[in-house]
């Protein structure tokens, strides 16, 4: 059928709960593309039907949730004007009881549920959620040994855990729980992750590098919106947080009841050599107070600032 | 049950370049460190390095100008190569993981190791 | 570089005896790490994050310590335990083994 063949490595995935799976191969899928799903090599193509408990969503495939009997081998179809492509997917589902004291981490579990803390550290965990725009997440809830975590060395940030000064006793189960949307119905994803402790550096001991801001202003009119993005590039092994603060603050937290100001969702882009990520911030109106305090961007010992400034009025105006 | 198991060959002349396997069954190596230490005879262990989940390489500083690891993560195989041999180089070397009660530092996992004799 | 030194560097003792081996760092270490390794053998974890005794190795081995300075004891020598031990850090690269302490039968 003209179609190159293309084979992912194995998903494990936990029975009962939503999954989602996009059909992307850059660059094949950046142009103009046809993209349909397949199941164990049926000729009939998975159905679009929203309302179906498995449906194709634009590239993706998503399962509202996934059952036992999901496990098999899928295809997404890729057609382009000149090309095809088959991409093979081979979905587990198993049966997981994450509060199972007996089980002492899961091996087989992709890597994205098997996360390292470096000790002594700040240092971070990520929930991943991949899901299409028509699933609409909650607030993130985070559980370790079954218990919901609180204290103060610990922050949520968007899909991640803060974890300050890594201490031995931070290794083991954890969770995060989020509460998915999706035509009118809520689900419950819930994702193990065994976490391991390291003294090791990592990455060498190398400094992320900022890219932009540049310790540097921005002229900007009162009452309008921006967004400045923070790009960084890193090793690929690195385990440093990007953030944005301001008075040594996470701005989500400085602005917290207000919710004027927010730090967006990172987003990184793999090269041969480093990630460039990147991390915005987002002014929804600026205000006066907000001209000459300097917006911290870090990134591990990094860091770098942006300074709000009125524009110099303009003489030719008069 | 995470095995390791090294391969390669057990004589190496000077000047030339060792090279050695390790097969990794019961864990995909790209999760955790995965390293290299050797025995001298008769004297202790020596770290030589590791390669990281992601392909990041540390190589002990002694060693660093003639040491490379590398992985095949389609075989589950890592791989050390170390340039230039002398007969210090003859030693017993092994492959080693951690990982255990969540303690990547912890090598509990190693192989069984493989005399290497630097000779003419 | 972190020097590890451990003594001593040979111990002859009796079945039935405490024995003490030390490791000291040249420089502060977070958490210390045993071996023991027999002839012909591959090492094996004994001790791990300074105190925690890895599975299958008996309650009379204990580890002890902090900054530059820890031991790892066994409070009654048995016939099993004639071995040579390692220990060794992660807390500053490059990571080193102690020079090891051989336990052999007097």
């Known amino acids: 059928d003209g179609c190159n063949d293309i084979f992912m490595k194995n998903e494990m995935l936990s029975a009962s709960q939503p999954f989602a799976f996009n059909c992307t191969f850059p660059p094949i899928t950046s142009g103009e593309v046809s993209v349909t799903w397949y199941k164990n090599s049926s000729k009939i193509p998975v159905s679009k039907i929203i309302q179906s408990r498995i449906h194709q969503d634009e590239t993706w495939i998503l399962f509202l949730p996934m059952e036992w009997g999901d496990s098999g081998v899928y295809q997404c179809v890729i057609k382009g004007r000149d090309s095809c492509h088959r991409i093979h997917v081979n979905l587990t589902v198993f049966e997981k009881q994450w509060c199972d004291t007996s089980v002492k981490g899961l091996p087989n579990l992709s890597d994205e549920y098997k996360q390292i803390l470096h000790l002594g550290k700040d240092d971070s965990l990520t929930c991943h959620l991949h899901f299409p725009k028509s699933c609409i997440l909650g607030p993130i809830k985070w559980y370790k040994d079954c218990n919901e975590i609180t204290g103060e060395r610990f922050t949520v940030l968007e899909t991640r855990l803060l974890v300050s000064n890594v201490s031995a006793e931070d290794r083991g189960n954890y969770a995060c729980q989020v509460i998915l949307t999706h035509s009118g119905k809520q689900y419950e994803v819930l994702n193990g992750i065994t976490v391991s402790i390291t003294e090791r550096a990592g990455y060498g001991g190398s400094v992320p590098k900022i890219i932009y801001p540049k310790n540097n202003s921005i002229e900007v009119q009162l009452g309008t919106t921006l967004i400045v993005d923070c790009n960084i590039t890193d090793t690929k092994d690195n385990t440093n947080l990007r953030c944005w603060r301001v008075n040594n603050t996470l701005v989500d937290d400085y602005y917290n009841e207000s919710k004027r100001i927010r730090e967006g969702v990172e987003t990184h882009a793999s090269f041969r050599e480093y990630n460039l990520y990147t991390v915005n911030i987002t002014f929804l109106e600026v205000k006066m107070e907000d001209y000459g305090l300097p917006f911290m961007c870090h990134a591990g010992v990094s860091a770098a600032y942006i300074m709000l400034q009125l524009p110099a009025p303009d003489f030719r105006a008069y | 049950q995470v095995q390791l198991q090294e391969s390669g060959p057990g004589l190496v002349k000077p000047s030339q370049t060792l090279s050695l396997t390790c097969t990794v069954s019961g864990a995909s190596i790209t999760s955790g460190y995965w390293n290299w230490i050797r025995n001298h005879p008769g004297k202790g262990l020596e770290y030589i390095?590791?390669?990281?989940?992601?392909?990041?390489?540390y190589y002990n500083p002694s060693l660093k100008s003639r040491v490379t690891i590398s992985r095949d993560t389609s075989k589950n195989q890592y791989y050390l190569k170390l340039s230039s041999v002398t007969a210090a180089d003859t030693a017993v070397y092994y492959c080693?993981?951690?990982?255990?009660?969540?303690?990547?530092?912890?090598?509990?996992?190693w192989g069984q190791g493989t005399l290497v004799t630097v000779s003419s | 570089d972190i020097q590890m030194t451990q003594s001593p560097s040979s111990l002859s003792a009796s079945v039935g005896d405490r024995v003490t081996i030390t490791c000291r760092a040249s420089s502060n270490v977070r958490y210390m790490y045993w071996y023991q390794q027999k002839p012909g053998k591959a090492p094996k974890l004994w001790i791990y994050?300074?105190?925690n005794l890895a599975s299958g190795v008996p309650s009379r081995f204990s580890g002890s310590g902090s900054g530059t300075s820890y031991t790892l004891t066994i409070s009654s020598l048995q016939p099993e335990d004639f071995a040579t031990y390692y220990c060794q850090q992660f807390t500053t690269s490059p990571y080193t083994f102690g020079q090891g302490t051989k336990l052999e039968i007097k």
């Open positions: 390095g590791y390669i990281s989940y992601s392909g990041y390489t």
């Open positions: 994050l300074t105190s």
């Open positions: 080693a993981t951690g990982g255990y009660d969540y303690v990547e530092d912890a090598l509990y996992y």
